[in-house]
């Protein structure tokens, strides 16, 4: 049974240039992680591998960065990156837990973030 | 080379306690969770559970809780088995096993011990 | 728990035959199955997982297929090599059941 539950940094704005971090956190459970993928959408941004370590997709090298810990850094944002984010934690033998972030890039400065939620 | 090796055959008298290892090389042990496998005589194979290798939590699967537990050492990057109060049913052969695979869809027990026959008679 | 039926307990066949051995879960388990092959005496030895990914190094008669509650492992062509005892297991959660191994025998 999948006792596990991920809290995430919700949802979240930031400035358009600026950079932002996403976090997710799994909790609750005894499963051990093998690996984590951050995707936006439908597109693999980054892996990070209990064994292997980081893997940041070649699309994104330039602008994605690893950590701190399991979260991913997202730097010289556009408006573009406007949407949702998704932290998928492979754990053994749960299976997978997934957790939820919307980014909202914004071109003034008026970006605040977003208060703690949990998914299940 | 990816390999795990276990301590041992074992001829204990019944209510004695035994302890069995599994010592891992060739990979980075914390990063892939172990499990216990029992085959008794004659028999198939029967998952007794696992220990989580990055926190030392360990998980007893029913039927093998209480006089089973599981350990690590990471310093020597070896798992543990102990078996206490021994009956003569716990006589088996049991073997380590790593969980490999790093995606929920792949994982399977790719590295498994040599195994180690436990024999329990007075 | 998911329980794993493996169907037949024991398989007579010859060499140079082609073999399916049958798995099914009490539920779905999408194509979280791996197969194991164990001689007498040793540890099992993993051919297939993921339902029909073969592991590195197995040669290339083995074939897995399946997925939701039934799953089949393939010999295409029997080895004197291939006369022992196949184990399923289900990772689907916990706990990991196996199958009740198939013993292949020569016929």
């Known amino acids: 049974m999948m006792t596990g539950t991920i809290e995430t940094t919700g949802n979240i704005s930031a400035e358009k240039g600026g950079s932002i971090i996403l976090q997710c956190h799994l909790s609750s459970t005894t499963a051990q992680v093998t690996q984590v993928n951050w995707e936006q959408q439908d597109q693999l941004l980054a892996i990070c591998n209990a064994d292997l370590g980081w893997h940041i997709s070649p699309s994104f090298k330039d602008r994605v960065a690893p950590g701190p810990g399991l979260g991913l850094t997202l730097q010289s944002l556009t408006v573009n990156d406007t949407g949702e984010y998704f932290c998928i934690y492979h754990t053994y033998p749960d299976g997978t837990y997934t957790g939820r972030i919307f980014l909202e890039v914004l071109e003034s400065s008026v970006a605040e973030h977003g208060a703690r939620f949990q998914i299940p | 080379e990816v390999q795990l090796v276990q301590s041992g055959s074992d001829l204990k008298k019944p209510g004695a306690s035994v302890r069995v290892s599994c010592k891992a090389s060739g990979y980075t042990f914390t990063s892939y969770p172990m499990n216990w496998v029992r085959q008794a005589p004659g028999h198939g194979l029967e998952w007794m559970g696992w220990?989580?290798?990055?926190?030392?939590?360990?998980t007893y699967v029913q039927g093998f809780t209480g006089r089973f537990v599981f350990s690590l050492d990471t310093s020597v990057n070896t798992a543990y088995l102990q078996i206490s109060s021994l009956k003569a049913e716990d006589t088996a052969v049991y073997f380590c096993?790593?969980?490999?695979?790093?995606?929920?869809?792949?994982?399977?027990?790719?590295?498994w011990g040599q195994g180690t026959m436990v024999t329990v008679s007075s | 728990d998911i329980q794993l039926t493996q169907s037949p307990t024991f398989l007579s066949a010859s060499v140079g035959d082609r073999v399916t051995i049958t798995c099914r879960a009490s539920?779905?388990?999408?194509?979280?199955l791996a197969w194991y092959q164990q001689n007498p005496g040793k540890a099992p030895k993993l051919l297939i997982y993921a339902a029909s990914t073969l592991q590195s190094g197995v040669p290339s008669r083995f074939s897995g297929s399946g997925s939701g509650t039934e799953f089949t492992l393939t010999i295409s062509s029997l080895q004197p090599e291939d006369f022992v005892t196949y184990y399923c297991q289900h990772l689907h959660g916990y706990p990991s059941n196996f199958g009740q191994g198939t013993k292949v025998e020569i016929k």
């Open positions: 220990i989580n290798t990055n926190t030392g939590n360990p």
């Open positions: 096993a790593r969980t490999g695979g790093h995606t929920y869809d792949s994982y399977a027990f790719d590295v």
């Open positions: 539920q779905v388990i999408s194509s979280s």
